[in-house]
């Protein structure tokens, strides 16, 4: 968690942030872990520390190693580690896996590719973008701020995208490149009448008096992004918030899951310290979307504790 991998290419700029975050007013000291030697803060050095940032301007293969940052508040010192690897530039076009940042997915509706780590650098627009080493040209490609937008995305747009920009430090310019894979999702979504997977209609749930109980209302609404879909619980036909029993609460927020490609939601009803009167209530799991509303009813019954005979 407080050790972070960072990588770059020789003769390019590399800026690394201390993985141990602190308030802006805290001081940060950097050390080369192998020798415990302090990293200078003077900007005339090729490698220097600047607060939370460690700057290699430019980087060399010999800079590879583990760097320690110690963040100091008035009363606490906390340590982080940056594992830095600088690679030689490849002569061919292929970008090896170890130089790739996380893969991003896009679709017809959303096709932004962010340039990784760019927020650490002092750069000015425009960014240059390359796909499989070819400069991107044509009206479908728009370099906007720190990301690339592709219009009318097609499956052929999948591939490795490299952003290239210039970092400026005290009037000197340094090149930076970063590459990530882009995959295209087929987003042929649809919406259907809600299907409640749990609870079953007219289900009887056994509960123990004095214990806590959870009821989960789970429903699926179609495939892909759903524009209006909700699941909720009612007590005797009344919204939980209006029912006024603090022991019975819906879980804040609905969990969205994609089961077999379907868009599903669930809502947990938590009953604390189950009481006799809870057995008399009608619990309704409601699922609704643009197609309509489906309701499954649950009732609680007393579970008799098992007798243990010696």
């Amino acid at each position: 968690k407080f050790s972070k991998q960072s990588w770059g290419l020789e003769n390019e700029a590399l800026i690394v942030r201390c993985p141990r975050q602190g308030k802006p007013s805290y001081t940060v000291d950097w050390y080369y872990s192998q020798t415990n030697k302090s990293i200078p803060t003077q900007e005339r050095n090729r490698v220097f520390a600047s607060g939370q940032l460690l700057k290699f301007l430019p980087a060399a293969v010999a800079d590879s190693g583990i760097y320690t940052c110690i963040v100091r508040s008035p009363t606490f010192n906390r340590t982080g580690y940056a594992n830095v690897t600088i690679y030689k530039k490849q002569s061919d076009c292929n970008v090896p896996d170890y130089l790739m940042y996380s893969t991003v997915s896009g679709s017809e509706k959303n096709s932004k590719i962010y340039c990784p780590t760019i927020d650490l650098y002092n750069w000015t627009a425009p960014l240059e973008w390359f796909k499989n080493c070819q400069a991107l040209q044509g009206s479908r490609y728009r370099a906007h701020k720190s990301f690339l937008v592709i219009d009318n995305v097609m499956t052929e747009d999948a591939g490795d995208y490299t952003c290239k920009f210039i970092h400026n430090e005290n009037g000197a310019n340094y090149s930076v490149t970063a590459t990530r894979s882009f995959t295209v999702k087929d987003e042929q979504g649809f919406s259907l009448f809600p299907v409640i997977g749990a609870p079953a209609q007219n289900e009887i749930k056994e509960v123990e008096i004095g214990k806590n109980a959870n009821l989960t209302c789970s429903a699926c609404f179609g495939k892909g992004t759903q524009f209006l879909a909700a699941v909720l619980w009612q007590l005797n036909g009344t919204k939980i918030t209006d029912f006024g029993e603090p022991r019975i609460q819906q879980e804040e927020g609905q969990n969205q899951s994609f089961s077999n490609g379907l868009a599903c939601l669930d809502m947990v009803l938590r009953i604390a310290d189950v009481k006799e009167e809870d057995l008399l209530l009608q619990y309704d799991c409601l699922a609704l979307n643009l197609h309509g509303l489906r309701r499954h009813t649950v009732r609680l019954s007393r579970k008799n504790p098992i007798d243990h005979h010696s």
Epitope: K1, F2, Q21, G22, K23, S73, T75, F76, R78, T79
Partner: antibody, heavy 123, light 106 residues
Framework: EVQLLESGGGLVQPGGSLRLSCAAS????????MIWVRQAPGKGLEWVST????????YYADSVKGRFTISRDNSKNTLYLQMNSLRAEDTAVYYC????????????????WGQGTLVTVSS | EIVLTQSPATLSLSPGERATLSCRAS??????LAWYQQKPGQAPRLLIY???NRATGIPARFSGSGSGTDFTLTISSLEPEDFAVYYC????????FGQGTKVEIK
Amino acid sequence: EVQLLESGGGLVQPGGSLRLSCAASGFTFSVYDMIWVRQAPGKGLEWVSTIRGEGGGTYYADSVKGRFTISRDNSKNTLYLQMNSLRAEDTAVYYCARDPWSTEGSFFVLDYWGQGTLVTVSS
Amino acid sequence: EIVLTQSPATLSLSPGERATLSCRASQSVDDDLAWYQQKPGQAPRLLIYDASNRATGIPARFSGSGSGTDFTLTISSLEPEDFAVYYCQQYNDAITFGQGTKVEIK
């Protein structure tokens, strides 16, 4: 010198409400995350709630979610805990404490604590 | 919720002896673990943070170790004022405390 002073505790019936206050001094209150921790008689410590500094984001233990509300007034250097629908199991000494470090989304230790105020929920 | 289990529940030792207290997490908390000391009628006092760092003003006889799920607080030579209840706290995912270990005079 950092000081935290809780008040507002007392005897309350089940289902009742109570508002605790914690007056802070000796540090720049607004930049620190503040926490309520409770301790039932003869029992261990239980985290109750955290409120961020100037951002004001809030976090709650499951046992109090929906019943307790943490808030702060940075102009008065005061932390609050509004407790509704109180239960017998909420009986405890309530401490306010300071988180000396946290950045958004993270938590840390509690370096200064008040002496606590006792809340008793009983009929 | 991350559950912290402290052992033993009670430790009976004499002044000058070495005390070893254990805290085990139900899942990894990296080094996001602290130790506190609490005496009767008092608020807890921070001893150790980030698993092994002593808080300001804490004597060198207190030391912490461990990472991930298993942590230890060691008091190298017990002083009379060290007899108290000790709690571990994780802050990797919200905040939870262990149930405490009481260090009592034998």
